[in-house]
Interface confidence: medium
């Protein structure tokens, strides 16, 4: 727990009047159907709402959609459907919002059958105005913006053509045919796979991977026999079919596909899959599915090259390709991830790592919580977190775990306390130290969101009945106040707040239903008057992350450094504000063997921190090869863990070995690569 806290509940005075003056209702003048909401830009207050109503007819589906715009965080909305000529917008494509604060929006319209191509509506001014553009193709996917230049768009057509626009969708050019998957890389590079013999499905495992760095003027084939590819951080991954059988392996490139290395990961068969769980510029979490229909696999963590992998977690729950996994990056504290494992008895248990996958443990039992009936020992049990898998299984879990980078240490999640995840109605738990300790925050399932960088937490009970009450806390979930935001309860459908958790506005979405009509309605509540003053220096306290033993000089060291944060005191009721920046003070730790992973050709015997050479690697299941310069193939057996910043201390030096003779691989030798131009 964060130190220096007052355990007393500090009540916010006169909050009903303050909130009543800042509660704004908007009734949408249309039938129910579906609603989707997008924020346009950061700190702009602009929200676009698209309501869609389908009327199934005998032969076709007639639909109508309405577009609304707010520029005050949802307090007021204006019907701007006329700006898109009252056209029916395709909800499956949603609203394609441009990166950063570009102010760009693309809406994809439904067009009548027989037309030459689709239609889009484009805006460059935060949806104040739209330009209608007829496309020379029918889009299969949403328009994808280049992360580097929001004028550059790409899309796939229903005929598998790859189309690119260089002027924000005004003009389009087909740069390649027979394309299965396309993605933007860095520096406006496009990576895509192509098929030769009829279809993507038929050619799976025989696809080619291509790259264009000049928006389609020239191309380079960077991979053959491709099953699929993915980008994560600075890594480009391809799963490649083996020559001799139906297995495939992961190959990795850090130079945009010019050179490839075989990843030191097990190969997988036809029914198995690889999945990049998380990636940054330092490293990758990779899931490798077990053979057979087990529902689990193994998590591996990579070195800084994406080549050498250490086994991180066994029996990791991941149901099928594109299926459900509970893997969650806790963004409020560095190095923390939560996921689920499938135990031998097939119950599901939650595990947490504080050091980027180095070690995994069960979550500590919340104080003052009893172990439930799943626990064999009533005094010893753990907290188990409900995430994607529970939601997919229709357990009573309305939301996945929540954390925000600027609400340091805070994690909110549904959970049960026992030996495994329970089917019972869960409660909501909160951690203020990145998952090290937990407290029950709310009884029963709720929707929740974080406002003002953690200064306010808002929650609404998950109920099948209409609701009219919202709960809020100004002390990180210790004490709650309830506010009745309307006399007439609504059927609640969702909470919406601006991404980034800096806003003090929350929108409650739902619908009213009477005998004859049902209408969308939103209530936007501004909490600015609850947090009357700006926070000052005295409102913050120093907190050392990952601290377990203050007496220990190395206390708080994770991946070679420790971080002290300035955190808002729970007892302070004040505004962090929109410009709040997390204040942290890093300090470097001395190196120990735990700051190193074993390089290729080496392994750690159980309960030993030293890396020992593997006796013979030729024909070994994890053989791999580095293309490139010979000096890359020398190793002393240790490699610094990606992102580890330790200095001094232990420096594992030993004889440098040349592993080139142990290296075998047959993927993409340079002579197999060729260049083509349009």
């Amino acid at each position: 727990s964060a130190p220096g806290e007052d355990e007393e509940c500090g009540r916010v005075r006169d909050f009903v009047a303050k909130l009543a003056n800042n509660t704004h209702q908007h009734v949408f003048d249309d039938l129910r159907g579906s609603v989707s909401l997008s924020w346009v830009g950061d700190s702009t207050g602009v929200i676009l709402v698209l309501t869609t109503f389908h009327v199934p007819l005998v032969i076709m589906t007639f639909g109508q959609s309405k577009l609304y715009r707010s520029e005050d965080y949802g307090k007021n909305f204006k019907d701007i459907t006329d700006l898109i000529n009252n056209t029916f917008i395709r909800t499956e494509f949603g609203m394609a919002i441009g990166p950063e604060n570009s102010g760009k929006v693309v809406l994809t319209a439904e067009v009548s059958g027989g037309s030459r191509g689709g239609r889009i509506f484009r805006s460059s001014d935060f949806a104040k105005n739209f330009v209608q553009t007829d496309l020379p193709f029918h889009p299969l996917t949403q328009m994808m913006y280049s992360p580097q230049n929001s004028d550059y768009l790409l899309a796939l057509s229903t005929e598998n053509g790859l189309w690119v626009s260089k002027n924000f969708g005004g003009k389009w050019e087909e740069i390649h045919k027979a394309v299965c998957l396309a993605k933007w890389g860095s520096d406006n590079t496009i990576f895509f796979t192509t098929y030769a013999n009829g279809s993507c499905k038929a050619d799976l495992g025989a696809l080619e991977l291509w790259r264009t760095s000049d928006l389609g003027k020239s191309f380079k084939t960077i991979g053959v026999k491709i099953y699929s590819f993915g980008l994560g951080g600075r890594f480009l991954f391809a799963s490649v079919m083996a020559d001799k059988d139906t297995t495939r392996r992961i190959h990795v490139s850090t130079d945009q596909g010019d050179t490839w290395s075989m990843a030191q990961l097990p190969s997988v068969g036809q029914e198995q899959f690889y999945s990049i769980l998380a990636a940054n510029d330092d490293m990758v979490f990779m899931h490798v599915d077990e053979p057979g229909d087990t529902g689990f696999g193994t998590i591996f963590t990579s070195d800084d090259r994406g080549i050498v992998y250490s086994k991180s977690l066994d029996r990791h729950l991941y149901t099928t390709t594109g299926g459900e996994t509970d893997f969650t990056n806790v963004t409020s504290l560095r190095g923390v991830y939560i996921t689920s494992v499938l135990s031998e008895d097939n119950s599901i248990q939650t595990m947490i790592t504080f050091d980027q996958g180095g070690r995994w443990t069960h979550l500590r039992k919340p104080e003052n919580s009893e172990c439930d009936a799943t626990a064999k020992n009533k005094n010893e049990c753990s907290l188990h977190i409900h995430a994607s898998y529970s939601i997919s299984q229709k357990l009573n879990v309305p939301m996945a775990p929540l954390s925000e980078p600027n609400a340091v240490g805070i994690v909110i999640a549904h959970g049960s306390v026992g030996d495994a995840i329970s089917v019972m109605v869960p409660d909501v738990y909160i951690s203020d130290d990145g998952g090290a300790s937990w407290t029950k925050m709310l009884e029963g399932p709720h929707y929740y969101t974080i406002l003002d960088s953690g200064g306010i937490i808002v929650a609404i009970e998950h109920s099948s009945r209409p609701i009219n009450v919202i709960k809020f806390s100004t002390d990180e979930g210790q004490c709650w106040q309830t506010y009745t935001f309307t006399r007439d309860p609504i059927y609640f459908t969702g909470l919406a707040s601006e991404p980034g958790a800096r806003s003090m506005n929350i929108s409650i979405w739902g619908f009213t239903e009477s005998f004859l009509t049902s209408q969308w309605v939103s209530y936007t509540i501004d909490f600015k008057d609850i947090l009357e003053r700006n926070c000052e220096e005295k409102d913050y306290t120093i907190w050392l992350a990952h601290s377990t033993d203050p007496e220990d000089y190395e206390d708080g060291c994770i991946l070679g450094y420790k971080e002290q944060f300035l955190r808002l005191r729970k007892s302070s009721v004040c505004q962090n504000g929109r410009d709040y920046v997390v204040t942290k003070q890093p300090s470097i730790c001395l190196c120990s063997l735990e700051d190193f992973l074993c390089d290729f050709g080496y392994y750690r015997p159980e309960n030993d921190s030293k890396c020992v050479e593997q006796p013979e690697l030729k024909g070994h299941d994890l053989e791999f090869c580095l293309y490139g310069r010979e000096e890359h193939l020398t190793t002393n057996g240790y490699r610094k863990i990606p992102g580890d910043k330790c200095q001094g201390g232990v420096n594992p030096v030993r004889e440098v070995k040349d592993l080139k003779k142990k290296c075998t691989s047959n993927f993409l030798s340079p002579e197999k690569q060729n260049s083509k131009s349009n």
Epitope: D293, T294, A373, L395
Partner: antibody
């Protein structure tokens, strides 16, 4: 020995509520879930819901959502099932059954479900105007 | 919800003969399956849990098999006290659901 003793038969009018009790003995009450199952005359078994004696959290079948409430009193090792807005089709024998499950399982080879191993003698509820 | 289907609805067997009862799930329930026996005027009695494990005190003539969606309860040599209604029940996903039952009667 382990046993579950239920309250006696009830006759109710449509629209009324009924509350059936189930007293557990012979084992640690909080160590097992309790399910409620009903059986209409000449029909099969129908699961209504489950209660966790620790904390009292519940999970109900969709069909009964909003009409059924399961509670427990740990001091007397008793669980209760209340069904409201009764209709004639609620006429049935209502059973409580000790249910060692309640764990969400996944994967192909679960060995976790132990079945409802102890049942109450049943409570007949008749709904008639 | 997962639908459990039992067949046949009625099974006529002579004492001493073998009886085979089937239970099919609408989607995989792994081994999260139990079998119960119910006699007129009595509460159900647990026979098999985990698809194949006999509950305490259940005679060896009762055996369960299967996994996923297809399950079988076998009574190797029917005794007079075995004539009853048998139900299968899944506990893979909430709500728990029962099959419609198979009545085993004397031929």
């Amino acid at each position: 020995q382990v046993q579950l003793v239920q309250s006696g038969a009830e006759v109710k009018k449509p629209g009324a509520s009924v509350k059936v009790s189930c007293k557990a003995s012979g084992y640690t009450f909080t160590s097992r879930y309790m399910s409620w199952v009903r059986q209409a005359p000449g029909q099969g078994l129908e699961w209504m819901g489950i209660i966790n004696p620790v904390g009292g959290s519940t999970s109900y079948a969709q069909k009964f959502q909003g009409r059924v409430t399961m509670t427990r009193d740990t001091s007397t090792s008793t669980v209760y099932m209340e069904l409201s807005s009764l209709r004639s089709e609620d006429t049935a024998v209502y059973y409580c059954a000790r249910d060692p499950s309640g764990i969400a399982a996944a994967g192909p080879a679960s060995r976790y479900y132990y079945g409802m191993d102890v049942w109450g003698q049943g409570t007949t509820v008749t709904v008639s105007s | 919800e997962i639908v459990m289907t039992q067949s046949p609805a009625t099974l006529s067997v002579s004492p001493g003969e073998r009886a085979t009862l089937s239970c099919r799930a609408s989607q995989s329930v792994s081994s999260n399956l139990a079998w119960y026996q119910q006699k007129p005027g009595q509460a159900p009695r647990l026979l098999i849990y985990g698809a194949s494990t006999r509950a305490t005190g259940i005679p060896a003539r009762f055996s369960g098999s299967g996994s996923g969606t297809e399950f079988t309860l076998t009574i190797s040599s029917l005794q007079s006290e075995d004539f009853a209604v048998y139900y299968c029940q899944q506990a893979r996903l909430g709500p728990w659901t029962f099959g419609g039952g198979t009545k085993v009667e004397i031929k």
